[in-house]
Interface confidence: low
């Protein structure tokens, strides 16, 4: 076959080819930032020709042109300044009101680099409509000058400007517009991934913690797609496996759904995820009929399996036909739920679709969503049943008319995105769920956010760092767990009762500064003395305390909560039945078996997860037993006597070996990891063997090196006496 | 000002471990993440890891991992690089640079020259 | 790894002239809306020297004759004007992700 001739130079830009100079490669101009190429690209045909899609002229000469940023068609109730024709990356335009008129948006906007206005659009409001005035975006002209109950306005874009978001809303009862804010862009544009991962974000974030749908949140996004935390998602992800997408940008489509998968599975809700790879023909790898789509591992396993040969043999972008296969899927399952059952009526659905270009085959991929948006019933009341978000990826053959008609629209929201790369994609993936960012109202607990940059406070937010400073004594040094804003939870031996408030120290999130310290909470039968008549010279039962906190700690990243037993947030963390019993939750997280755990040590001043095993099955007995061998308990008759109910028993070396704590470690938590979710059990309270003498831990311990901690289920009635304001228990 | 001084020059036989250290001075240690890069005589920069000092979590280019280790002493704002199993083709300059809030090597320590020799 | 590299592997240029040296990234560098590229000048026997950091940005108290421009994965660096004192070597280095690369250099000579 021919190959095409190489006089293809960009002037001041560069070119990729996807296979050479052989035909069916594809051409890529791009150019330095701020600078947009024209044409984008060329294809070589088997006649050994560069065919330029859209062009007249097949070989025009390639050149990077200036980005510039639409103008403003006309600004109602006031003046804009300067009046250009289109405006260069990083010029201004500013916005001011005629009397009796406020501005609301930007009032002035500057020109970006990927030819989009930063801030929003500015109106100016007298605020005498049912609905406020929908404005008019940069570059748009609208009809419909009445913003009464019922009224429509109709928006078009100037010249060749491209419009997503809604080309019509209507004023709603609720004094809302219907649909989202038309955004009349430049063909070449694209969107930043900052940009993008809060938009995606915010709206996942909402449906998967549960706000109230109709609360406004600080943002003032609006509604938000959202979850009741009984409720049940299906996510559905499509991946473009055709010709122009390469390996490795396939590699990076997998890697930011896994991030994805691993994110939803940490949340507060039943979730189903199907995977579909399409090119000519869509491949289902995991249908959300399968009960594994319920299972984080199988979801990512199936995703990690996804082959980009699978396809290697229809190289078209079949869109159609892959939203058909969510379609089939969706028919399925309501066939075997029933249609009028509340379980197939309370699914709530979201596709997001990853492509790097418009759909060259199979019909037109609109007609799959209508066909899905009539199964689901999708109306003005059940819109929060289903979003799409449609996501191009590559300036190259994207198509922006397409992946606005495919996206959901709704007011406050953006559905369709499109990105520079497979790179800003996966930072968007990255950033779109971080539970920091998420609203005071989504407070889950036992949450962990991990960043490659990240400190241990990242892996680890809720530890805290004890102090005691004790005049001529020196100082006691334990761990704590945040368990709300306002208390954390360690051990009562970290403390004596002449230790006062000042001379406590607490820190969280890896600060440096300390917090100022209310009151410190004692167990009440919590008495180190309790049995010195009886030769047991320290007495640990019930050695759990609450630190209140003078102020209240500002959640973000490295400071977050974790869960507690018999908890409204446990359930929710657990995706337990909302009717789940504490005893139910005791069975779920302390079976009587050997249990696997974690406790968060220092060494070196990092902190580190170890791993231990809670005996709680049939090596309990000789773990309790093991406590004769700790200093001063070797003439204890009857080890009940130190090991009461209240104790959990880790150490040993079976099953494995287990990690023992250090002084240090004391007051901090045992941890269930469960469901991408750490639940606190036991505090940790004492050891049989100093296994960290001169601060370094021995390589070699006894086997009877056992740790015992405070079980948490045994000290609820305190723990919900105390906490019961900031916190809600189940029934005990 | 800104200055990072590195140890001495260090001859070394094969198999053997170096220990280069980069005291730093005139802004916070604990702000800015340590570099560590290499050069060989005539040639050119190779990129052996970085230490946040605050948290002393680290990075490592994987051709080093194993042998190198990035450590820092905060209380005397000084970060350290040791290498081990040090062969001929580890004869360089080694540097400590400090990132800036981009990312870049703004500083650079005076370099340190081992020289591994039997 | 990101492999950068830079072309010419040398060049000669008279005094007063331009310089432009080119770096090409085996992989976007951009992320955030910025591109992590930056470039160094090394002299014989001295640590090398911050010039331009994020592409573009000229490091403060570099002559404003040195500029960068360039995004994704194609970067240049410039010298309007040449000085006797520009006779080095000069590195491109990024750091958009772990592990981060240099490029290996070009040297400059005055003709």
């Known amino acids: 076959a021919p190959s095409c001739p190489q006089n293809v130079n960009i002037s001041g830009g560069t070119f990729t080819l996807s296979h050479g100079w052989a035909p069916g490669s594809l051409l890529t101009y791009s150019c330095p930032q701020g600078l947009y190429p024209s044409p984008a690209s060329r294809l070589c045909k088997s006649s050994g020709q560069w065919q330029t899609p859209g062009a007249t002229r097949s070989l025009s000469k390639a050149v990077c042109k200036p980005v510039r940023c639409p103008a403003p068609v006309s600004f109602e109730n006031g003046i804009y300044t300067p009046r250009l024709g289109s405006y260069p990356v990083g010029g201004n335009v500013s916005f001011e009101c005629e009397d009796g008129f406020i501005l609301r948006g930007s009032p002035v906007r500057q020109c970006r680099p990927n030819g989009m206005w930063d801030g929003e659009t500015a109106v100016c409001d007298n605020g005498a409509g049912h609905c406020p005035n929908p404005g008019i975006s940069l570059g748009a002209v609208r009809t419909g000058f009445r913003f009464g109950h019922g009224d429509k306005v109709r928006y078009r874009c100037s010249s060749n400007l491209v419009l997503t978001g809604s080309s019509e809303r209507e004023c709603q009862g609720n004094g809302v517009w219907s649909g989202t804010e038309p955004i009349c862009r430049q063909p070449y544009s694209y969107d930043f991934p900052e940009d993008v991962a809060p938009a995606l974000g915010t709206s996942f974030s909402h449906m998967l913690g549960a706000t109230n749908p109709t609360q406004k949140t600080k943002e003032s996004l609006g509604r938000k797609i959202q979850i009741q935390r009984s409720g049940h998602l299906n996510l559905y992800l499509l991946l473009d496996c055709s010709q122009s997408v390469s390996e490795n940008d396939f590699l990076i489509f997998k890697e930011s759904a896994s991030l994805m998968v691993d994110r939803i599975f940490s949340f507060e809700i039943n979730v189903s995820v199907a995977i579909i790879t399409f090119a000519s023909e869509p491949k289902v790898l995991m249908s959300v009929l399968n009960d594994n789509s319920r299972d984080m591992t199988e979801v990512i396993s199936s995703l990690e399996n996804a082959n980009y040969k699978d396809h290697e043999n229809g190289t078209g972008t079949n869109t159609y036909a892959a939203l058909n296969s969510v379609y089939l899927m969706m028919n399925n399952q309501m066939r075997l739920l029933g249609m009028e059952t509340m379980a197939w009526q309370e699914i709530r659905h979201a596709i997001i679709l990853l492509t790097d270009g418009k759909s060259n085959m199979g019909g037109s991929p609109k007609t799959a969503v209508d066909h899905i948006r009539e199964i689901l019933n999708i109306n003005q009341k059940r819109n929060d049943y289903l979003d799409i978000y449609a996501i191009g990826v590559g300036k190259l053959d994207v198509d922006w008319r397409e992946l606005n008609e495919l996206g959901s629209k709704k007011d406050g929201e953006r559905h369709a995105f499109i990105l520079q790369d497979t790179k800003a994609l996966h930072q968007v993936f990255e950033h779109m769920l971080d539970v920091s960012k998420l609203t005071d109202t989504i407070c889950l607990c036992g949450m962990v956010w991990e960043h490659r940059k990240g400190t241990d406070y990242h892996k680890q937010p809720w530890q805290a760092k004890i102090s005691v400073i004790r005049p001529s004594k020196g100082h006691e040094s334990c761990m704590g767990a945040v368990v709300s804003e306002y208390f954390v939870l360690t051990a009562a031996h970290c403390f004596t009762v002449d230790d006062k408030e000042h001379s406590i120290k607490v820190s969280v999130g890896g600060e440096k500064r300390d917090l100022e310290i209310e009151v410190v909470l004692f167990h009440p039968n919590y008495n180190i003395n309790g049995k010195k008549e009886a030769g047991i010279p320290e007495f640990y039962d019930y050695d759990v305390a609450l630190i209140k906190l003078k102020n209240k700690l500002k959640y973000g990243q490295t400071i977050r909560p974790i869960c507690l037993p018999c908890t409204e947030g446990t359930t929710r963390a657990l995706r337990l039945p909302p009717t789940t019993t504490c005893q139910q939750q005791k069975e779920e997280l302390l079976p009587a078996q050997d249990i696997k755990a974690l406790f968060v040590s220092e060494e070196e001043k990092k902190l580190t997860r170890k791993e231990v095993y809670i005996k709680n099955g049939d090596k309990k007995g000789s773990c309790e037993r093991d406590a004769q061998y700790a200093p001063g308990y070797d003439k204890v008759k009857d080890i009940s006597e130190v090991v009461t109910p209240r104790f959990l028993c880790t150490g040993g070396v079976s099953p494995y070996a287990d990690p023992n704590t250090c002084r240090g470690d004391s007051g901090g938590p045992l941890i269930v990891h469960k469901r991408s979710r750490f639940i606190q059990v036991g505090v940790i309270s004492w050891g049989v063997v100093d296994v960290c003498k001169n601060q370094k831990r021995q390589k070699q311990v006894p086997a009877h090196a056992r740790d015992f901690h405070i079980n948490l289920f045994q000290v609820l009635p305190w723990l919900k006496e105390k906490l019961q304001d900031v916190l809600n228990f189940l029934p005990l | 000002e800104v200055q990072l001084v590195q140890s001495g020059a260090e001859v070394k036989k094969p198999g053997a471990s170096v220990k280069v250290s980069c005291k730093a001075s005139g802004y916070t240690f604990t702000d800015y993440n340590m570099d560590w890069v290499r050069q060989a005589t005539g040639q050119g920069l190779e990129w052996i890891g970085d230490i946040n000092p605050n948290y002393e979590s680290t990075g490592y280019n994987q051709k080093f991992k194993g042998r190198a280790t990035m450590t820092v002493n905060k209380s005397i704002s000084t970060a350290y690089m040791e290498l081990s199993s040090l062969r001929s083709e580890d004869t360089a300059v080694y540097y400590c640079?400090?990132?800036?809030?981009?990312?870049?090597?703004?500083?650079w320590g005076q370099g340190t020259l081992v020289t591994v020799s039997s | 790894d990101n492999v950068l590299t830079q072309s010419p592997d040398s060049l000669a240029v008279s005094l007063g002239e331009r310089a432009t040296i080119s770096c090409r990234a085996s992989k976007s560098v951009r992320t955030s809306g910025y591109n992590y590229m930056h470039w160094y000048q090394q002299k014989p026997g001295q640590p090398p020297k911050l010039l331009i950091y994020?592409?573009?940005n000229l490091k403060s108290g570099v002559p404003d004759r040195f500029s960068g421009s360039g995004s994704g994965t194609d970067f240049t660096l410039t010298i309007s004007s040449l000085q006797a004192e520009d006779a080095a070597t000069y590195y491109c280095q990024h750091s958009r992700e772990l592990p981060y690369t240099f490029g290996q250099g070009t040297k400059l000579e005055i003709k």
């Open positions: 994020l592409a573009s």
């Open positions: 640079a400090r990132e800036d809030d981009h990312d870049a090597f703004a500083y």
